[in-house]
Interface confidence: low
C-alpha cells in the first residue's frame, strides 16, 4: 500500500536568464528511494539520480542543469522556452512509483520571484 505523498514547489516563476530550484520531497512513507527521474514538459529526461550510482545529467541539458540540492535540480540560464511542466518521479521500494508536478513560468519582468513554498499536488 502506498502511504507516501510528494510535496513539490508547486507553481513557481523565475526571471529569464536567472536560475531556479526544482524540488520534490517524499514524506509519510518509510519506503527506500532507489531512483529519482526529472522530466521536462515534452517528456524529455533532464536528469536521473540513482541512489547507488549517483547523478546523470542528460547531454542536451549538461550546460544548464546542475544536480541538487539534495534530490532536487537547479535550472540555470533560463529561457522563455523553459516555461512549462516538470515532473519528478520517485522510484521507491517497496511502495512503487510516486510522481510530482511543478509548473515553471519564466518571466521577462524583473518582478518575477521564485517561490520556495512546498505544495502537495
Amino acid at each position: 500500500m502506498m502511504t507516501g505523498t510528494i510535496e513539490t514547489t508547486g507553481n513557481i516563476s523565475a526571471k529569464k536568464g536567472g536560475s531556479v530550484i526544482l524540488q520534490c520531497h517524499l514524506s509519510s512513507t518509510m519506503a527506500q528511494v532507489t531512483q529519482v527521474n526529472w522530466e521536462q514538459h515534452d517528456h524529455s529526461l533532464l536528469a536521473i539520480r540513482n541512489a547507488e550510482l549517483g547523478w546523470h545529467i542528460y547531454p542536451a541539458f549538461k550546460d544548464r542543469v546542475a544536480p541538487g540540492p539534495g534530490l532536487g535540480l537547479t535550472l540555470q540560464s533560463l529561457t522563455m522556452n523553459d516555461t512549462g511542466e516538470y515532473f519528478c518521479t520517485y522510484h521507491t521500494y517497496p511502495d512503487g512509483t510516486y510522481r510530482g508536478r511543478i509548473f515553471l513560468e519564466v518571466l521577462e519582468s524583473s518582478v518575477a520571484e521564485h517561490s520556495a513554498r512546498f505544495q502537495i499536488p
Epitope: L45, N50, P59, Y93, P94, T97
Partner: antibody, heavy 121, light 110 residues
Framework: EVQLVESGGGLVQPGGSLRLSCAAS????????VPWVRKAPGKGLEWVGY????????YYADEVKGRFTISADDSKNSLYLQMNSLKTEDTAVYYC??????????????WGQGTLVTVSS | RIVMTQTPLSLSVTPGQPASISCQAS??????LAWYLDKPGQPPQLLIS???KLASGVPDRFSGSGSGTDFTLKISRVEAEDVGVYYC????????????FGGGTKVEIK
C-alpha cells in the same frame, strides 16, 4: 537508417562457448540501453541482460548469471554477448534491441533480425 | 524478481470485432509497461510504451491503459494482420530484474 544487426550464432555442443555480436547503425550506441532478449522454440520472449548505458553496470537474468557476459565497444558501435558453459535450454533466437529512451520508458523500439543459437550434442 | 502474468493465453477473434488482453505485474511497475506484437519470422514490434503511448507507425486501433500493477491492451477492430503473439513487458527500477516479459497471448482470426 536506424538498425541493429546480430551475428555469431550457430551450432555448439553443451558446455561450449559462443560470442554474439550486435552492430548498431544510425544512432549513437552509447546513449541507449541495448538489452539482449531471446526466444526459445515454443517459448516466449525472455530478457537475457544488458549494460546500463548511463551508469555502466551489467545486469543479467538469473538463468544466465555467471555464464554470460555482456560488453560494449562504443568506438565500433557494437555490443557483445559472450556465452560460456552453454546448456541445451539456451537454444533460442537471440535479439539485441534498442531501449529508445532509457530512464523514461524502458521500451524496445528497434530490434535486430535475431541470430539462432543451437546447443546440441 | 518481478513476474508478469498475461491473460488469456489465446484469443480467437472475428475480424472487425474488439479484443482485449490483460497483464498483471507482481509489483507496482507503473509507468514502465510496454506491449509488443511478435509475428513468425519477424522480430517483435513495439506497439505501446509507458502503458498508453502509441509507438510510431502503429495503427490507432491499438490502445493501452492501466497503472500500478494492472494493464490492458485493446484492439478496437481486429484485422487479419493483427495475428501473432502479444507480450507485455515491464521494467522494475528498484532491483536488477531488468526487462520482464509476460508469457504471451496468441491472437488468431476466426
Amino acid at each position: 537508417e536506424v538498425q541493429l544487426v546480430e551475428s555469431g550464432g550457430g551450432l555448439v555442443q553443451p558446455g561450449g562457448s559462443l560470442r554474439l555480436s550486435c552492430a548498431a547503425s544510425g544512432f549513437d550506441f552509447s546513449s541507449y540501453g541495448v538489452p539482449w532478449v531471446r526466444k526459445a522454440p515454443g517459448k516466449g520472449l525472455e530478457w537475457v541482460g544488458y549494460i546500463d548505458p548511463i551508469f555502466g553496470p551489467t545486469y543479467y537474468a538469473d538463468e544466465v548469471k555467471g555464464r554470460f557476459t555482456i560488453s560494449a565497444d562504443d568506438s565500433k558501435n557494437s555490443l557483445y554477448l559472450q556465452m560460456n558453459s552453454l546448456k541445451t535450454e539456451d537454444t533460442a533466437v537471440y535479439y539485441c534491441a534498442r531501449d529508445y529512451s532509457y530512464g523514461y520508458a524502458y521500451a524496445l523500439d528497434i530490434w535486430g533480425q535475431g541470430t539462432l543459437v543451437t546447443v546440441s550434442s | 524478481r518481478i513476474v508478469m502474468t498475461q491473460t488469456p493465453l489465446s484469443l480467437s477473434v472475428t475480424p472487425g470485432q474488439p479484443a482485449s488482453i490483460s497483464c498483471q505485474a507482481s509489483q507496482r511497475i507503473s509507468p514502465y509497461l510496454a506491449w509488443y506484437l511478435d509475428k513468425p519470422g519477424q522480430p517483435p514490434q513495439l506497439l505501446i510504451s509507458r502503458a498508453s503511448k502509441l509507438a510510431s507507425g502503429v495503427p490507432d486501433r491499438f490502445s493501452g491503459s492501466g497503472s500500478g500493477t494492472d494493464f490492458t491492451l485493446k484492439i478496437s477492430r481486429v484485422e487479419a494482420e493483427d495475428v501473432g503473439v502479444y507480450y507485455c513487458q515491464s521494467y522494475y527500477v528498484h532491483t536488477s530484474s531488468g526487462y520482464a516479459f509476460g508469457g504471451g497471448t496468441k491472437v488468431e482470426i476466426k
